[in-house]
Amino acid sequence: VPRWRQQWSGPGTTKRFPETVLARCVKYTEIHPEMRHVDCQSVWDAFKGAFISKHPCNITEEDYQPLMKLGTQTVPCNKILLWSRIKDLAHQFTQVQRDMFTLEDTLLGYLADDLTWCGEFNTSKINYQSCPDWRKDCSNNPVSVFWKTVSRRFAEAACDVVHVMLNGSRSKIFDKNSTFGSVEVHNLQPEKVQTLEAWVIHGGREDSRDLCQDPTIKELESIISKRNIQFSCKNIYRPDKFLQCVKNPEDSSCTSEI
């Protein structure tokens, strides 16, 4: 008789999850000299230990502490780029602007980017069939708790001017329920962070509106100001040109507004 298995609403663990995490760890440590002493076997053991044999709706930040310790990494605190609902462009930007970092440019973010994982209570098995959905099942699931933990730490580390890339094509340009809105905004440290600068990325070719006047941006400004952090906002009307100008700042067309 097959053992009864909990059916969750979300997709199951990404196939070849252990192999993917280990391979990514080795690749990352190879590329980043300051992380070459990292023991990827220990990293995987700590990652696994955070969720294996535990109920996937009962995961805590504490479960991830060994992994957080192993992934401790110093990034320049004044070179942090946060993003919300516009990951691809943020990553394209830091691939060009090599001295700036998104969370996924750190070891822990790189390991988990685009992956799903969960286990089962009291068994050492990884659940490849289904994992809890944040909305439909539970918020304290392995993936959500991981991203909440690393996002909090990343925001806490930031200093000086922090940039955030926001998607101007969405109905809520700033969404209080996003990881940025619910975690990162509230964990920026006012004693270290002087300014949060939002870059609102326009989607349409002919979109010339000032999206910095959007009500949700005003809401973000209000939250940030109440936390004693200055706020500034820029429209990025042409994201393609924006990236091109980051690559080639000397280009004559890069003096005009992008």
């Epitope: 440590t29 190879e30 000299p33 990292v38 023991d39 220990s42 053991d45 060994p66 310790k69």
Partner: antibody, heavy 121, light 107 residues
Amino acid sequence: QVTLKESGPALVKPTQTLTLTCTLSGFSLSTSRMGVGWIRQPPGKGLEWLAHIWWDDDKRYNPALKSRLTISKDTSSNQVFLKIASVDKEDTATYYCGRIEVGRGAWFAYWGQGTLVTVSS
Amino acid sequence: EIVLTQSPATLSLSPGERVSVTCKASQDVVTTVAWYQQKPGQAPRTLIYSASYRYSGVPARFSGSGSGTDFTLTISSLEPEDFAVYYCQQYYTYPFTFGQGTKVEIK
């Protein structure tokens, strides 16, 4: 098979610079992911990590000795060198080189047999 | 720097006995610990890495355990060739450090 062999002067005078050589075989330091480190052991005492160097010339030093240490490599001869400046009696030790690998942590899977260096006038 | 304290300094035992050597780190190193065996006049030899993984070719009687600050090397049944000095090493952070060693001698 993988082997490492240390060589250097058996005797050096205080204040001189000691140069040690680690000759590698069975693997190449031009191969991605490989590194070689130096560890020493004073007579009757424990082990001390000194420095290591990676295939791409990234170097790491023990902060307590950093000002006196220089690690380098010659890929063509498959050798790694360690220079210790201004030696004194406390530098008398058996010096080992060992291999490390990216992604495995900095533990030493392979060791040379060691070379004993005495600092004396 | 992280200080590793091994205990005991010396163990006097007979072949066939079980051995436990402990290594205590001055701060949490998760599982980034290796164990080495060193015989007189020889270089150290790797036994255990990542706290609990036996290195290739190492007999099954050797095992490692622990995480955080407390680690143990166990030899389930001492063989005559196991009489040696055992060192732990942390590679969690620079500078990498070793314990002072534990000598396992014949009683």
